[in-house]
């Protein structure tokens, strides 16, 4: 190989051992029978050597830098060429470094060809291993600026008082130029700006100078984004530190075409702007730090660039005005991620605040808009607490628990509707009346409609599941002692035309000692299925709950359990059930963890079952499944 | 109305075995209630001996398991308390009880049975 | 096994006037505690179960309160018939163990 510099380029070339491998030969560059391990040429100077081994591509690597004084004359502007030329380097993994010094109020801007950059965070590489590390100064501080690879939006970087710019090629590149040309401009009173283009959909990750370290201490950094004029654009932060400041505040400002309060200024805590139409800017300004404590600045952020859809011209009105205690929050609905660039999914506040998730509350009328490219993404799920604090004023109130027609209306699939009822303990009680029966969900019997609701206690340290029932059943009421939270939850997009059969009355009552009452009315020739709660885990220790089967004049039910043992084996306490004919008042009593349960039973009146659990020993849980079929009087039973 | 009567000798000799028998009238045993022994020595507090349930099940105060043995006799409507080996410290007034599994608490007993160990 | 101590172990006391006996269980007995009522050559009688539940046909001055470890049994105004030994018991696990008694006396 033969290297020769022409005088005054003021290049130089360094050839010096890469990482150390655990090849067993060492390998040598070789200059007039001298073996050597660096190698450096300097402007004007010619060497010819050759290496030692067949693959020098695995030992050495290659530094070609080219020092650009712009202080003393007038710069080089324009393509910027690799000097010397690729084919008249050996094949090692080289590096090519231009190292600008300008002065403080002269502008440095390095343009980069097609393909555009795309910037990489810590400990990420480039696919092709074609890295481009740039890095700019203040007075003799270097500040990293970012790592790039190919294939990305960023178009232009402009910088002031020098710029250093570092290409690393593998050695099996056939790469041949730069790609980017250097040009002055005027001063940008700032530490850099970067020019991101996007020609169609897509997103750029971007990162503060000196990621993930922080950023230098009262400086300006700029993104100027190109966006398609047809095209929406929002940010997302996905990382960011905040320093401590003694003076002034670190903030991000827009400047949005068309807003009327230009620059914006956000927190970095802030819900970021999103929904933008065409180019805008975004600058993050750090602060005075504390010299004792400086903490860091730093941002990594994206802006995501899709199409707007029918939906983001479309303003709904969410009024919650008249609500109380009420929160609804769109969020995405869980999917499994894949690989392949998916369009963001936002909702926006007065069209202008977007994020992926939005939680509106009560007490005032929202207008929100949707940033999305299939709604079908999104749900939505309310909570709204009922409470009654005083006795003596709620007893006997009564209030519906209906979704109101305004969540209804919004093009986006409700998931959840919970309402959490919270009654003075040991004052007062609850009951739920369904506009129509409801039906246990059981395996036996599964719910198919749209939507069910679930019954859970809302006690902190009750784990109370009283199950999930849905329409068209026979549960006429459910009687619960305390606290509880009931959850409409949808299943079926069907749902809206069905939400007329969804509500629900919850009155206060006069308190009484059992966890839950069901009352039962069985419709003729159908089974009704019933468990206890807290089917999957056991019914809690000490809890007792009670089915008040109502058996018309002219049937007769048949009572009938699905196994011969309850299974439950008590640590402390009694576990038991009581059948009680409610006309006679004649009971039939079981231990649950002494008998068997009963064989299938005839009754000619209304009845009652209650169960009421002991403490079991662990992995002895009591659950149990019954059913209540009707038959006419007039069959032989016997 | 359910009545609990105990039965049995009023003096035991040393080393031999106490027996009594708690009759049960105006209620069938075998229903849902566990049938217990508690005894009280004279001028103390009460002791509870054991209980039963009517499918056989048994529960002895570890005190006294190693001598004590309650049976159920359904068909008679009656259950029995055995307690070998009896000493002087075993001379009590004996009930029998009735344990409602609802109620966990001994709500109808019989009227008591003295039993002295003396030689 | 589950101590109960009751206390005070004898009580002087005048017709008409409310009084409580406490019984202290040396672990949680949730409310499984009842109440008996002794006469001198009589059987115990139930007064309260459940810690907190009177016993059909027992005077509603006896009411009963508590649950895990502490409980106390109140007799809001004493009749003469109330002159009697009381014993608490608890039925949470075996052996199931009374208390040691509380003789109320006449003052």
């Known amino acids: 190989f033969e290297i020769a510099l022409p005088r005054e380029s003021n290049i130089t070339v360094l050839i010096k051992l890469g990482t150390p491998t655990l090849l067993a030969k060492p390998c040598y560059i070789v200059i007039s029978k001298r073996h050597i391990t660096m190698l450096s040429i300097k402007s004007g100077e010619r060497i010819v050597f050759t290496f030692s081994c067949q693959s020098p591509e695995n030992h050495f690597v290659i530094e070609i830098q080219k020092n650009i004084d712009c202080m003393s004359g007038p710069c080089p502007f324009g393509e910027v060429q690799l000097q010397p030329s690729t084919s008249l380097l050996p094949t090692l993994n080289r590096t090519f470094i231009w190292d600008v010094k300008a002065h403080k109020s002269i502008g440095l801007e390095l343009q980069f060809s097609i393909p555009r950059l795309r910037q990489i965070g810590p400990g990420e590489s480039c696919p092709d291993g074609v890295t481009h590390s740039i890095s700019g100064r203040i007075d003799a501080t270097v500040v990293r600026i970012g790592t790039f690879c190919s294939n990305g939006t960023v178009s232009r970087i402009k910088m002031q008082e020098g710029v250093k710019m570092a290409l690393h090629l593998p050695w099996f590149h056939p790469r041949n130029v730069s790609g980017f040309s250097i040009a002055n401009r005027s001063s940008i009173k700032r530490l850099c700006i970067i020019e991101s283009v996007f020609e169609g959909e897509g997103s750029a990750t971007l990162m503060s100078a000196n990621y993930p370290e922080g950023f230098p201490e009262d400086e300006l950094m700029t993104w100027q984004f190109v966006v398609p004029a047809h095209l929406r654009a929002s940010v997302s932060f996905l990382n960011f530190n905040l320093s401590n400041c003694e003076r002034k505040e670190e903030r991000v400002e827009y400047y949005i075409p068309g807003s009327t309060t230009n620059p914006e200024v956000f927190k970095l805590e802030d819900k970021q702007p999103g929904n933008m139409a065409g180019n805008f800017n975004l600058s993050l300004q750090g602060c005075d730090q504390d010299a004792q404590s400086p903490g860091i600045l730093r941002l990594q952020f994206q802006v995501l660039v899709q199409h707007p859809q029918n939906e983001s011209n479309k303003i709904y009105v969410v009024d919650l005005s008249n609500e109380r205690a009420m929160s609804l929050t769109i969020e995405p609905r869980p999917v499994k991620q894949s690989r392949k660039f998916v369009p963001g999914c936002f909702v926006c506040l007065e069209s202008r605040t977007c994020s992926s998730n939005l939680t509106l509350t009560s007490g005032s009328k929202h207008k929100i808009s949707f940033l999305c490219d299939d709604l079908t993404r999104l749900w939505m799920n309310v909570e709204k607490t009922i409470s009654c604090t005083d006795h003596r004023y709620c007893q006997r109130k009564s209030y519906s628990l209906q979704v109101p027609s305004d969540i209804l209306h919004l093009p986006v699939e409700l998931h959840d509707f919970s309402w959490k009822l919270l009654v003075p303990k040991d004052r007062l009680s609850l009951v739920l009346v369904p506009a129509q029966k409801l039906q246990q969900h059981t395996h036996e019997k599964p719910c198919n409609t749209s939507f069910s609701y679930l019954v859970a206690s809302a006690i902190p340290s009750q784990d109370l599941y009283f199950g999930s029932f849905c329409p068209g059943g026979s549960i006429k009421q459910i009687q619960v002692k305390q606290n509880i939270s009931v959850t409409l939850r949808t299943f079926a997009p069907s749902f809206q035309q069905e939400a007329s059969r969804q509500g629900l009355t919850v009155s206060f009552i006069p308190y009484f000692k059992e966890e839950g009452v069901f009352t039962v009315t069985p419709d003729t020739k159908s089974k009704v299925y019933l468990r206890t709660p807290n089917w999957d885990r056991g019914l809690p220790s000490l809890t007792s709950v009670s089915w008040n089967i109502s058996v018309p004049r002219d049937q007769v039910a048949c009572l009938t359990f699905f196994k011969e043992r309850s299974g439950v084996v008590c640590q402390t306490g009694r576990a038991f059930m009581i059948i009680q004919e409610q006309r006679t008042r004649a009971e039939e009593i079981f231990s649950l963890d002494e008998d068997v349960l009963p064989k299938p039973s005839f009754h000619h009146h209304s009845f009652w079952v209650n169960i009421s659990n002991c403490s079991p020993t662990s992995g002895k849980q009591l659950d149990l499944l019954f059913s209540v079929t009707l038959t006419p009087r007039t069959v032989d039973l016997t | 109305q359910v009545q609990l009567q105990e039965s049995g000798p009023g003096l035991v000799k040393p080393s031999e075995t106490l027996s009594l028998t708690c009759a049960v009238s105006?209620?069938?045993?075998?229903?849902?209630?566990?049938w217990g022994w508690i005894r009280q020595p004279p001028g103390k507090g009460l002791e509870w001996i054991g209980s039963?349930?009517?499918?056989?099940?048994?529960y002895y105060n570890p005190s006294l398991k190693s001598r004590v043995t309650i049976s159920v006799d359904t068909s008679k409507n009656q259950f029995s308390l055995k307690l070998s080996s009896v000493t002087a410290a075993d001379t009590a007034v004996y009930y029998c009880?009735?344990?409602?599994?609802?109620?966990?608490?001994?709500?109808?007993w019989g009227q008591g049975t003295m039993v002295t160990v003396s030689s | 096994d589950i101590q109960l101590t009751q206390s005070p172990s004898f009580l002087s006391a005048s017709v008409g006037d409310r009084v409580t006996i406490t019984c202290r269980a040396s672990?949680?007995?949730?409310?499984?505690l009842a109440w008996y009522q002794q006469k001198p050559g009589k059987a115990p009688k139930l007064l309260i179960y459940?810690?907190?539940t009177l016993q059909s046909g027992v005077p509603s001055r006896f009411s009963g309160s508590g649950s895990g470890t502490e409980f106390t049994l109140t007799i809001s105004s004493l009749q003469p018939e109330d002159f009697a030994t009381y014993y608490c018991?608890?039925?949470?696990?075996?052996?199931?163990?009374f208390g040691q008694g509380t003789k109320l006396e006449i003052k």
């Open positions: 672990q949680g007995i949730s409310s499984y």
């Open positions: 009880a009735r344990d409602k599994i609802t109620v966990a608490a001994f709500d109808i």
């Open positions: 018991q608890q039925l949470n696990s075996y052996p199931y163990t």
């Open positions: 105006g209620y069938s045993i075998s229903s849902g209630y566990y």
């Open positions: 459940a810690a907190s």
């Open positions: 039963i349930y009517h499918s056989g099940s048994t």
